[in-house]
């Protein structure tokens, strides 16, 4: 039978599962731990003091915890401050905790101390360098000075020149005694171990403003914008270059050591990039605004005032035109133009046209044409209707004919025709 | 017919100075680039000094430069070399030359010369 | 200075046989923006120089079809096909690739 139905084993209302080997297992409620759920859970009460993380655990059928410390706090439920977060040890020694709650440093070789601050000067104890190397002390170590024939850092080998070779810069090392060497060098380089790199630019060859700057066994002129080529003796055609040299529609010239723009007019500069200020010598006449354009300015007018240059009275000012024309001013002499509406005419638009007059009758089908101010009307005869009379009436419209007669749409009249057995001018 | 006409050649003195004249005809003299070029008798050929179109730009080669002065007057059609502290071996006949374009330098009219003897 | 050396220096040529001047220059021609400037000039006897090729192997307008340059980099010669006896003179080369400009020493070229 299941090991859960056979009376729960759970304690404490813990929750009984059959795992997959088909043993019992307890889940436990807040509080409880152990196999059975039988032993209080020793975190239920927060024994880790601040920020500690509590983990519980059984041993030998105990409950036991134990708290996972935040940074700057040590001891068994994390109240003790831990004396290593200020970093009391110096140069890079490892710090612990001793029994006693205080730091312990572990010292690096060469130092020593409590905070292995002290300098342990180990020329003092005994004697490090060999075949009569001086001993000097330099902060957490110490270095040997060799006599001559001896090398490495206890003086402990004799000396071979060329090995390692001194020679820098790929220059080849020939010994030349028994301790000394001869460095022959690179082209290029110079001094005892090549490490001199040769300065090239003395009588150097850059041209036109070239600029030398040193390589190695060579140099390289840095040419001004105008030239180019190794020495800077070729001239470099502007012209040529993308984008192009001369701005705005302006021709390039090419030039020896630099190139030339003629402007397109309204344009000038260098590279004809500056717009030329018409307005500099433009003549708009006193509280006129003056604009400059490409080549050419506008001024605009204060009111009361037009012309090119502003300095003609506004003629329209004074509205010398009818009322609807339209006043504009000759900007060569000031004066009004009046644009009539229709219907008027005359320089001032107050004189009436007589549509009735001028050409043909503006009224169809014989209408008869009346003259009103800044128009005209029509007088429509039987039949028409319409501003000039052009539409026949559909007599029709009304429905005039009874007893589901045809209605014929006649010019001012209309007839019907009746169904059999009626009649009547409506079949009525 | 475009023509170059140089004139003010003739013997100086060691130290003296000397003004060449070329009188362009029959094209647009502003138009173009110029140089004056010297051959010493017997010799080759030695470039002396260039002249932009509009005057703006010049050069000289180290044998002539802070001595020699290339100048032109366009409304007059006429290139200039102004020419001090004259040496025996300035000795040359003086031609000037139109440069056909600006990109590629070479000469496609020169002058018939005028000689310059500089002789104690 | 770019040094442009000329070969030979004389040449005795019999009417209607080919000639040819070799230049050579101290230091390329070939100009950084792409062109080469190396040009020929022939100077008459008693006459002002005159343009017969520009730029390797252009001819000039007026320049008979029997002349013709060639070459690259530093080496350039002139050919003329058919001598003919109003080609007398001296023939120079000239580069304006490098300032300054300089020219050949020059060749002489006489009819046998």
């Known amino acids: 039978a299941p090991p859960c139905l056979d009376g729960s084993p759970c304690a404490n209302g813990g929750r009984c599962t059959q795992l997959p080997s088909r043993e019992a297992a307890c889940l436990c409620p807040p509080g409880w731990v152990g196999e059975r759920c039988q032993l209080e859970d020793p975190c239920h009460s927060g024994p880790c003091a601040g920020r500690g993380v509590c983990q519980s655990s059984v041993v030998a059928g105990t409950a036991r915890f134990s708290c996972r410390c935040p940074r700057g706090f040590r001891g068994p439920d994390c109240s003790l401050p831990d004396p290593c977060l200020s970093s009391p040890c110096a140069h890079g020694a490892r710090c612990s905790v001793g029994p006693d709650g205080r730091f312990l440093c572990s010292c690096p070789p060469g130092y020593q101390g409590r905070s292995c601050r002290s300098d342990v000067d180990e020329c003092r104890v005994g004697e490090p360098c060999r075949h009569g190397g001086t001993c000097l002390n330099t902060p957490g170590s110490f270095r040997c000075q060799c006599p001559a024939g001896y090398t490495g850092p206890l003086c402990e080998n004799p000396a071979v020149p060329c090995a390692p070779s001194p020679c820098r810069n790929g220059g080849t090392c020939r010994q030349s005694g028994d301790l000394t060497y001869d460095c022959a060098c690179l082209p290029g380089f110079e001094g005892q171990n090549c490490e001199v790199n040769v300065d090239d630019c003395p009588g150097h060859r850059c041209l036109n403003g070239g600029t030398c700057v040193d390589g190695v066994n060579t140099y390289n002129c840095q040419c001004p914008p105008e030239w180019t080529g190794q020495f800077c003796t070729e001239d470099v055609d502007e012209c040529q270059l993308q984008p192009n040299a001369c701005h705005n529609g302006g021709t390039c010239f090419n030039t020896l050591g630099g190139h030339s723009c003629v402007c397109v007019n309204g344009w000038t500069g260098e590279s004809c990039s500056q717009n030329i200020d018409d307005c500099a010598t433009a003549v708009c006449f006193h509280g006129a605004t003056c604009h400059d354009r490409v080549a050419s300015f506008y001024c605009a007018c204060p009111m009361g005032k037009t012309g090119l240059l502003c300095h003609l009275d506004d003629a329209c000012v004074s509205n010398p035109c009818h009322e609807d024309a339209i006043c504009d001013t000759n900007p060569v002499n000031g004066r009004a133009i009046c644009t009539c509406p229709p219907g008027f005419t005359g320089g001032a638009c107050d004189q009436d046209v007589d549509e009735c007059s001028i050409g043909a009758n503006p009224c169809e089908h014989l209408g008869r044409c009346v003259n009103t101010q800044g128009s005209f009307l029509c007088q429509c005869g039987r039949g028409y209707t319409g501003p000039r009379c052009e539409t026949d009436v559909n007599e029709c419209l009304s429905g005039p004919c009874r007893n589901q007669a045809t209605c014929l749409d006649r010019i001012g009249q209309f007839t019907c025709i009746c169904m059999a057995g009626f009649t009547g001018t409506y079949c009525e | 017919e475009v023509q170059l006409l140089e004139s003010g050649g003739g013997l100086v003195q060691p130290g003296g100075s000397l003004r060449l004249s070329c009188a362009a005809s029959?094209?647009?003299?502003?138009?173009?680039?110029m140089s004056w070029v010297r051959q010493a008798p017997g010799k080759g050929l030695e470039w002396v000094s260039y002249?932009?179109?509009?005057?703006?730009?010049?050069y000289y080669p180290d044998s002539v430069k802070g001595r020699f002065t290339i100048s032109r007057d366009n409304s007059k059609n006429t290139l200039y070399l102004q020419m001090n502290s004259l040496r025996a071996e300035d000795t040359a006949v003086y031609y000037c030359?139109?440069?056909?374009?600006?990109?590629?330098?070479?000469?496609?009219?020169w002058g018939q010369g005028t000689m310059v003897t500089v002789s104690s | 200075d770019v040094v442009m050396t000329q070969t030979p220096l004389s040449l005795s040529v019999t009417p209607g046989q080919p000639a040819s001047i070799s230049c050579r220059s101290s230091q390329s021609l070939v100009h950084t923006q792409g062109n080469t400037y190396l040009h020929w000039y022939l100077q008459k006897p008693g006459q002002s120089p005159q343009l017969l090729i520009y730029?390797?192997?252009n001819r000039f307008s007026g320049v008979p079809d029997r002349f013709s340059g060639s070459g690259s980099g530093t080496d350039f010669t002139l050919k003329i096909s058919r001598v003919e006896a109003e080609d007398v003179g001296v023939y120079f080369c000239s580069q304006s690739t490098h300032v300054p400009w300089t020219f050949g020493q020059g060749t002489k070229v006489e009819i046998k």
């Open positions: 030359g139109r440069h056909a374009t600006t990109a590629y330098w070479y000469f496609d009219v």
């Open positions: 029959g094209f647009t003299f502003s138009n173009y680039d």
């Open positions: 730029k390797v192997s």
């Open positions: 002249i932009s179109r509009g005057g703006g730009s010049t």
